[in-house]
């Protein structure tokens, strides 16, 4: 009488998460009487996957009808495979008894599960930085298997080279995670720029996953200030304008100072946007020259995005002709008690 053999023909089987796996097993003899069981892993800690004798295993079915005695095929289907199902599966024949006695095990079939990486999530710095500074972006993707994966960084379509990538864990696992940090040097033109993290994996069939981040969230372009005056039609009035150029983001507070004293404060509104994504804004004062005859310094002070204020000063120029137009009744001290009229545009 030939000795019973348990044959598992495949050394390994690979399936994609969500699909079904078929694990094949045949026996060369039905003698002695006793159940066939499937286990994941070997040794005392092995996990029972299917017992053809009894039990409720909702994800496992036999390939052929187990009630046909002359059927020596004990192959099983496992449905809805997840990465947690990875491992080596053993088909084991027992002799009926109390307890059942293990007679022979198959050589085992290693089930590897191909699992897609999650959509890459790109996160930028917590604080904004100014042009010429370097900022870091992090890209994370999880739950993929096998471990081999390729990650690339792009800025506006151009591949970046300054990045560091780690795949965890280092050892064998049911699934893996990748984390990569790229260093990007900001320029003044980066308000409209975008960084892209691209992940390629065997499960994606050549169609990589991408995660993006906008540099607009990471950059602060400080404004440049210019203050100038222009005469008005009324001979005793001049327009003093503060031109705030090329700033990002929009948040801006402007204060006019008259010889160091706060004259008025306003928040930027009605901005004009430049092609590069930065903004311009201008604020102006209508100054009565008769109230300000000599030595008045007007200062435009700008606080941008919560940063320390920058300022630009302008000494008010009053011509001899304008002075002549002022009657004695309108002349007064250098710091006129009445605040000058202001405006913005």
């Amino acid at each position: 009488e030939e000795e019973l053999q348990v044959i598992q023909p495949e050394k390994s089987v690979s399936v994609t998460a969500g699909e079904s796996a078929t694990l094949n097993c045949t026996v060369t003899s039905l003698i002695p009487v006793g159940p066939i069981q499937w286990f994941r892993g070997a040794g005392p800690g092995r996990e029972l996957i299917y017992n053809l004798k009894e039990g409720h295993f909702p994800r496992v079915t036999t390939v052929l009808d187990p009630t046909k005695r002359n059927n020596m095929d004990f192959s099983i289907h496992i449905s809805n495979i997840t990465p947690a199902d990875a491992g080596t599966y053993y088909c084991v024949k027992f002799r009926k008894g109390s307890p059942d006695v293990e007679l022979k095990s198959g050589a085992g079939t290693e089930l590897s599960v191909r699992a897609k990486p999650s959509a890459p999530v790109v996160s930028g710095p917590t604080a904004r930085a100014t042009p010429e500074h370097t900022v870091s972006f992090t890209c994370e993707s999880h739950g993929f298997s096998p471990r081999d994966i390729t990650l690339k960084w792009f800025k506006n379509g151009n591949e970046l080279s300054d990045f560091q990538t780690n795949v965890d864990p280092a050892g064998k696992s049911v699934s893996y995670s990748i984390r990569s940090t790229a260093r990007v040097v900001l320029t003044r033109r980066d308000v409209h720029s975008q960084v892209i993290c691209e992940v390629a994996h065997v499960t994606l069939q050549g169609d990589p996953l991408r995660g993006t981040a906008n540099l607009s969230e990471a950059i602060r372009v400080p404004p440049t200030l210019e203050v100038f005056q222009r005469p008005m039609r009324a001979e005793n009035q001049v327009n003093v304008t503060c031109q705030v150029r090329k700033f990002y983001p929009q948040r801006l507070l402007l204060t006019w100072l008259e010889n160091g004293n706060v004259s008025q404060t306003e928040t930027a509104s009605t901005l004009t946007e430049n092609k590069d994504g930065t903004y311009n804004w201008r604020s102006w004062l209508l100054v009565n020259t008769c109230a300000h005859r000599d030595g008045v310094v007007l200062t435009c002070q700008v606080e941008h995005d919560g940063q320390p204020a920058v300022s630009k000063s302008h000494a008010l120029e009053v011509s001899a002709h304008q002075k002549e137009q002022c009657s004695d009744t309108t002349s007064g001290p250098v710091l006129a008690p009445t605040a000058p009229l202001g405006g913005s545009g």
């Epitope: 009487v33 004798k53 187990p66 009630t67 005695r69 009926k96 109390s98 307890p99």
Partner: antibody, heavy 118, light 107 residues
């Protein structure tokens, strides 16, 4: 349809012999462990004998040496040769198929009556 | 030989009742226990194998449990056709042995 049909029962004197037959249909008898179970009038069930797929045979103590179980694959039939019959062997004899993994009984014949009496 | 003891030997119940029959083995039989139903003048019918698995076509009102030496058969809601004699059987080792039977009668 899977079916077992017994025959060969009847009245026999003590010390006499009888051969019971069980014809199987709807399955291959040689692929299963097969059994004989009996039930004396008004009594419970008693397992009598079995034959395994390899031809190995088993008997309950009271019939050992007197009864012989066998099968004929060509006829898909099971037999029980009963010799030296006693009054205590009087019973309905059932042919039973053992189940797939563990030999649990699944299919029963309708039974044949054996009466041992003088 | 392994002795099988059923209790009670007889039981009176009404239609709709839930009844439980117990079976005890004289030694550990793992879960190699079967239950059979027999009506007068008929061959036994296989109900349950490996203590809790229902044979094909057996209604789910029948359920079995237990392992080792103590086992139960439960019929959840008795119907007229369920009044019969029930037997347990061990089949872990030869000679296979049956319990003495439990006669379930209508009250």
């Amino acid at each position: 349809e899977v079916q077992l049909v017994e025959s060969g029962g009847g009245l026999v004197q003590p010390g006499g012999s009888l051969r019971l037959s069980c014809a199987a249909s709807g399955f291959t008898l040689s692929s299963y462990d097969m059994h004989w179970v009996r039930q004396a009038p008004g009594k419970g069930l008693e397992w009598v004998s079995a034959i395994g797929t390899a031809g190995d045979t088993y008997y309950t103590g009271s019939v050992k040496g007197r009864f012989t179980i066998s099968r004929e694959n060509a006829k898909n039939s099971l037999y029980l040769q009963m010799n030296s019959l006693r009054a205590s062997d009087t019973a309905v004899y059932y042919c039973v198929r053992g189940g797939v993994w563990d030999d649990a009984f699944d299919i029963w014949g309708q039974g044949t009556m054996v009466t041992v009496s003088s | 030989d392994i002795q099988m003891t059923q209790s009670p030997s007889s039981l009176s119940a009404s239609v709709g009742d839930r009844v439980t029959i117990t079976c005890r083995a004289s030694q550990d039989i793992n879960n190699y226990l079967a239950w059979f139903q027999q009506k007068p003048g008929k061959a036994p019918k296989s109900l349950i194998y490996t203590a809790s698995s229902l044979h094909s076509g057996v209604p789910s009102k029948f359920s079995g449990s237990g392992s080792g030496t103590d086992f139960t058969l439960t019929i959840s809601s008795l119907q007229p056709e369920d009044f019969a004699t029930y037997y347990c059987q061990q089949y872990v080792s030869y000679p296979y042995t049956f319990g003495q039977g439990t006669k379930l009668e209508i009250k």
